[in-house]
Interface confidence: medium
C-alpha cells in the first residue's frame, strides 16, 4: 500500500457524505446502497463511521459529472477515467466524482428490476441462458402473450428463476388508469394503435390507452422504459431494440455480434435492419458503481494506489464478486486510522430489495398467462395537461430573505432568468427567486433563496425551463446544465452532453416546440432540443431572426408564459404569438410593470 506525503488523513472519525446528484443508469435506491456498501467496507476494518447527510457541508461530496465538470480535472468520455477523488481536507478535498459518460451498473450489465415471476423482485442477470441460447436483454421467447421476461440467474435452464421486465403489457406508469397495462390495439382520434405512441403529446413521452377506445374512455398510462434494450451509439441512440429483427435475411431475437469484427453486441431498432438500416449497440456489462466507489473512497480517505494487483486500490478496474478488500488495503487504511475496536465485525450483509407487489409464484417455465396480481398505481393526473399546482415550490419550505428595497421584485431592473413552473412565473436574480401568479392585485412573492430549494445551483442562472410531464426543471448557467426532479439533481453536466458545441457559451432561453421538443436559444442562434433524449439536433441550428422576425438580436432571456414566447432585452420584453405558423410580435412591454403588474410610481 501507499499513502501520501505527510500521511494525509481525516482528523475525525465520524465522516459525513452527501450524494449531490445521481446517474440515470441505476435506480436511486441502488446507487444509495452501492455507496453505503462501499463505505461499509472501510468502516468494517477501521474506527471510521460514515453518515449520510444532505448538505454541501459534508466531508465527502459525491457527484456524477461529465467532461470538464468544474474541478479542473476533466473526464474523458466512455471508458478511460471512470471516476476520481481528492485527498482528505476541506472544501473539494475528499470529494469523489464519477464519470456519467460511463454505463454504471453493478458490474454485470444494466440493472433491470423484475416484477412478479418467482425471483422476489431480483434484477435480471445478463447474459442468461434459456433453452441453450444466450440472451443479453429481456425476451418474449417461450411465451405466447408478448410479455418480456428475464432470468435472474445466469442460467434459466438449470435455475428456473425469472421475473417480468418493465413492459407496457404488464403495467403502465402515472396516467389515470391505476397502472393497468396497455390495451392493444386501441383507438385514439379515430385511429388504431398497436404500440405505445407519442401522438397527441408535445413532450415525446410514450403512452397508450388502457382500454380499447381512448376516445370513449379517456383512460391511459405511460409506457415504462426498457434499460436493457435501450441502445447506445449507432444511428439510433436512445431507441429500443426491436426483437425479433431481420439481418441479412436471418431473424434475431437477442443482441448479436454478427457482421462485426470487434465482438460488440448490437441490435436493430426496427424489425428489419436490411430495409431500414437502423441500429445501435446493446448495453455492455457496465462498471460496478460499488467497486469503483470503494476504490475512490479509499483515495478520499488518504490511500494512494497499491502495487498489489489483487488489491482494491490497484489502479485498474477489475470486476470481482468476492470480498473486495485485500490484506494490503486493510494494512494501508489501518496505517492511517488504526484498527476497528473489538469485536471484529462480520462482513457487511446486503438484503435483496423486496418487490413492490407480492410476487406470484409461477410454474417452472415462464408463465403464459398474465400474473394474477397487478402493480400498484402511480399518481393519477390529467393526461396531457400541465400540473395542477406549482410542482416544485411551496412557501412553507422556502426561506424568505429579510426584505430590503432591492428584494422587492418590482425594483429589479433585469432578471437573470424567468420561467413558468407549474402555473406560476418564477423570476431569478443573484441567488434569489420570486414567484408570481397572475391575478388582480397580485404581487410577486419572495424573495426566496435558490440555495434552499435547489442547493446544487450557482447564484447566477442564464435560463430555466420546466418539462411539463415529468416536471423536470432544467437550469442553465454558463456551459453547464442541472436537471432537477423534485429535490434530486442530475448535474452539473456540460452543454456538450446536450450536443451543443464548445462555441455555445450559454443557453439563454427555451420554448416548447411540438412533440417532445424544445427550442434552445443562445444569443442569435437556436436549436431544436429533444427533451426525452436530452440532445439537440445539430442540423436544426438556425438564426433567431429567421424564425422570430422582429425580436431583438441580443436577448438575454427567452421564456414561455401562458403559451406565448417572451424575448427579454434589458428591462423590456417582446411577446410573440404564433398564428397559422407565423410568429409575430404582438406586444412590447416592461417585465415589471406589464407582467408583474408593479405600480408605476
Amino acid at each position: 500500500f501507499q499513502t501520501f506525503e505527510g500521511d494525509l488523513k481525516w482528523h475525525h472519525h465520524n465522516i459525513t457524505y452527501w450524494i449531490q446528484n445521481y446517474s440515470e443508469d441505476l435506480p436511486r435506491a441502488v446507487i444509495d446502497d452501492a455507496f453505503a456498501r462501499a463505505f461499509a467496507l472501510w468502516s468494517a476494518v477501521t474506527p471510521l463511521t460514515f453518515t449520510r447527510v444532505y448538505s454541501r457541508d459534508a466531508d465527502i461530496v459525491i457527484q456524477f459529472g461529465v467532461a470538464e465538470h468544474g474541478d479542473g480535472y476533466p473526464f474523458d468520455g466512455k471508458d478511460g477515467l471512470l471516476a476520481h477523488a481528492f485527498p482528505p481536507g476541506p472544501g473539494i478535498q475528499g470529494d469523489a466524482h464519477f464519470d456519467d459518460d460511463e454505463l454504471w451498473s453493478l458490474g454485470k450489465g444494466v440493472v433491470v428490476p423484475t416484477r412478479f415471476g418467482n425471483a422476489d423482485g431480483a434484477a435480471c442477470h445478463f447474459p442468461f441462458i434459456f433453452e441453450g441460447r444466450s440472451y443479453s436483454a429481456c425476451t418474449t421467447d417461450g411465451r405466447s402473450d408478448g410479455l418480456p421476461w428475464c432470468s435472474t440467474t445466469a442460467n434459466y435452464d438449470t435455475d428456473d428463476r425469472f421475473g417480468f421486465c418493465p413492459s407496457e403489457r404488464l403495467y403502465t406508469q402515472d396516467g389515470n388508469a391505476d397502472g393497468k397495462p396497455c390495451q392493444f390495439p386501441f383507438i385514439f382520434q379515430g385511429q388504431s394503435y398497436s404500440a405505445c405512441t407519442t401522438d397527441g403529446r408535445s413532450d415525446g413521452y410514450r403512452w397508450c390507452a388502457t382500454t380499447a377506445n381512448y376516445d370513449r374512455d379517456k383512460l391511459f398510462g405511460f409506457c415504462p422504459t426498457r434499460a436493457d434494450s435501450t441502445v447506445m451509439g449507432g444511428n439510433s441512440a436512445g431507441e429500443l431494440c426491436v426483437f425479433p429483427f431481420t439481418f441479412l435475411g436471418k431473424e434475431y431475437s437477442t443482441c448479436t455480434s454478427e457482421g462485426r469484427g470487434d465482438g460488440r453486441l448490437w441490435c436493430a431498432t426496427t424489425s428489419n435492419f436490411d430495409s431500414d438500416k437502423k441500429w445501435g449497440f446493446c448495453p455492455d456489462q457496465g462498471y460496478s458503481l460499488f467497486l469503483v466507489a470503494a476504490h475512490e473512497f479509499g483515495h478520499a480517505l488518504g490511500l494512494d494506489h497499491s502495487s498489489v494487483p489483487e488489491a482494491l486500490m490497484y489502479p485498474m478496474y477489475r470486476f470481482t464478486e468476492g470480498p473486495p478488500l485485500h490484506k494490503d488495503d486493510v494494512n494501508g487504511i489501518r496505517h492511517l486510522y488504526g484498527p476497528r475496536p473489538e469485536p471484529e465485525p462480520r462482513p457487511p450483509t446486503t438484503t435483496t430489495p423486496q418487490p413492490t407487489a407480492p410476487p406470484t409464484v409461477c410454474p417452472t417455465g415462464p408463465p403464459t398467462v398474465h400474473p394474477s396480481e397487478r402493480p400498484t398505481a402511480g399518481p393519477t393526473g390529467p393526461p396531457s395537461a400541465g400540473p395542477t399546482g406549482p410542482p416544485t415550490a411551496g412557501p412553507s419550505t422556502a426561506t424568505t430573505v429579510p426584505l430590503s428595497p432591492v428584494d422587492d421584485a418590482c425594483n429589479v431592473n433585469i432578471f437573470d432568468a424567468i420561467a413558468e413552473i407549474g402555473n406560476q412565473l418564477y423570476l431569478f436574480k443573484d441567488g434569489k427567486y420570486w414567484r408570481f401568479s397572475e391575478g388582480r392585485g397580485s404581487r410577486p412573492q419572495g424573495p426566496f433563496l435558490i440555495a434552499d430549494k435547489w442547493p446544487a445551483l450557482p447564484r447566477k442562472l442564464d435560463s430555466v425551463f420546466e418539462e411539463r410531464l415529468s416536471k423536470k426543471l432544467f437550469f442553465f448557467s454558463g456551459r453547464q446544465v442541472w436537471v432537477y426532479t423534485g429535490a434530486s439533481v442530475l448535474g452539473p453536466r456540460r452543454l456538450d452532453k446536450l450536443g451543443l458545441g464548445a462555441d455555445v457559451a450559454q443557453v439563454t432561453g427555451a420554448l416548447r416546440s411540438g412533440r417532445g421538443k424544445m427550442l434552445l436559444f443562445s444569443g442569435r442562434r437556436l436549436w431544436r432540443f429533444d427533451v426525452k433524449a436530452q440532445m439537440v439536433d445539430p442540423r436544426s441550428a438556425s438564426e433567431v431572426d429567421r424564425m422570430f422576425p422582429g425580436v431583438p438580436l441580443d436577448t438575454h432571456d427567452v421564456f414561455q408564459y401562458r403559451e406565448k414566447a417572451y424575448f427579454c432585452q434589458d428591462r423590456f420584453y417582446w411577446r410573440v404569438s404564433s398564428r397559422s405558423e407565423l410568429n409575430q410580435v404582438d406586444q412590447v412591454g416592461y417585465v415589471t410593470y406589464d407582467i408583474l403588474q408593479c405600480p408605476e410610481d
Partner: antibody, heavy 124, light 107 residues
C-alpha cells in the same frame, strides 16, 4: 529519472503548420494528465492545451481553439501538439509539462516536470 | 477566467534576507495553487503545490501558505541561486491561469 523532451519547433510563415512532439520517459506516461504551456519572448507563462490520461478529454485555451490539436500515443510515451493556421502571436517557447495528478487520484495542483522547451517562431 | 495578480512585480533583496511574495486570485480557488521558479533560459520548476506542500527536492527555506484568494510564498533566507522569476498558478477553476510573475533580484 523523469524526462520530457520536446521537438518539432522552428521557423514557420503565418498560416503555416507545425507538429510538436514530447517524448516522455521515467514514469508511467499513460496514467498522467499532460499539458502544453507556452511562453512568448520576455513574457509570462500561458496554458495552451490539456489532455487526459486516456486521451479521451482534450481542452484548449481560447487563443488556440480550433487551430491546435493535442493528442498522445501511450504506446510510444509521446505527447503531440498539431499547430495549424499559425499566427505571429503564437511565437513562443512551447513546453510540455507533466501533471502531479495521475489517473483517478487528483487534487495535486502543479506541474512537477517540464521539458526544456522548443522555440516556435511565426514570421514572414 | 480567474485572474491571478502577483505583487510586487519586482522585489530587490540581499542574500540572507527573507522574501515574501504575494499572489491574489480574483475569486476563491480553495488551496489549488502552485508556485514555480524560472531562471533565464530554463524551464519552470515546481516549488510548492496545493498552496503549502513542498515539491520533491525543494529546500526547506521555501514555504507556501494561504487559501481562498490570498497566497504567499516565503523564502526564509535568500541564497544566491534563489534569484529568478516566480509564478503562481491556479487550478481552482477552469481554465487554469498563471500570475504575471514576480522578479526577485539581488539588491
Amino acid at each position: 529519472e523523469v524526462q520530457l523532451l520536446e521537438s518539432g519547433g522552428g521557423l514557420v510563415q503565418p498560416g503555416g503548420s507545425l507538429r510538436l512532439s514530447c517524448a516522455a520517459s521515467g514514469f508511467t506516461f499513460s496514467r498522467y494528465h499532460m499539458w502544453w504551456v507556452r511562453q512568448a519572448p520576455g513574457k509570462g507563462l500561458e496554458w495552451v492545451s490539456y489532455i487526459s490520461p486516456s486521451g479521451g478529454s482534450t481542452l484548449y485555451a481560447d487563443s488556440v481553439k480550433g487551430r491546435f490539436t493535442i493528442s498522445r500515443d501511450n504506446s510510444k510515451n509521446t505527447l503531440y501538439l498539431q499547430m495549424n493556421s499559425l499566427r505571429a502571436e503564437d511565437t513562443a517557447v512551447y513546453y510540455c509539462a507533466k501533471d502531479r495528478a495521475y489517473g483517478d487520484y487528483v487534487g495535486w495542483n502543479g506541474f512537477d516536470y517540464w521539458g526544456q522547451g522548443t522555440l516556435v517562431t511565426v514570421s514572414s | 477566467d480567474i485572474q491571478m495578480t502577483q505583487s510586487p512585480a519586482t522585489l530587490s533583496l540581499s542574500p540572507g534576507e527573507r522574501a515574501t511574495l504575494s499572489c491574489r486570485a480574483s475569486q476563491s480557488i480553495s488551496s489549488f495553487l502552485a508556485w514555480y521558479q524560472q531562471k533565464p533560459g530554463q524551464a519552470p520548476r515546481l516549488l510548492i503545490y496545493d498552496a503549502s506542500y513542498r515539491a520533491t527536492g525543494i529546500p526547506a527555506r521555501f514555504s507556501g501558505s494561504g487559501s481562498g484568494t490570498d497566497f504567499t510564498l516565503t523564502i526564509s533566507s535568500l541564497e544566491p541561486e534563489d534569484y529568478a522569476v516566480y509564478y503562481c498558478q491556479q487550478r481552482g477553476n477552469w481554465p487554469i491561469t498563471f500570475g504575471q510573475g514576480t522578479r526577485l533580484e539581488i539588491k
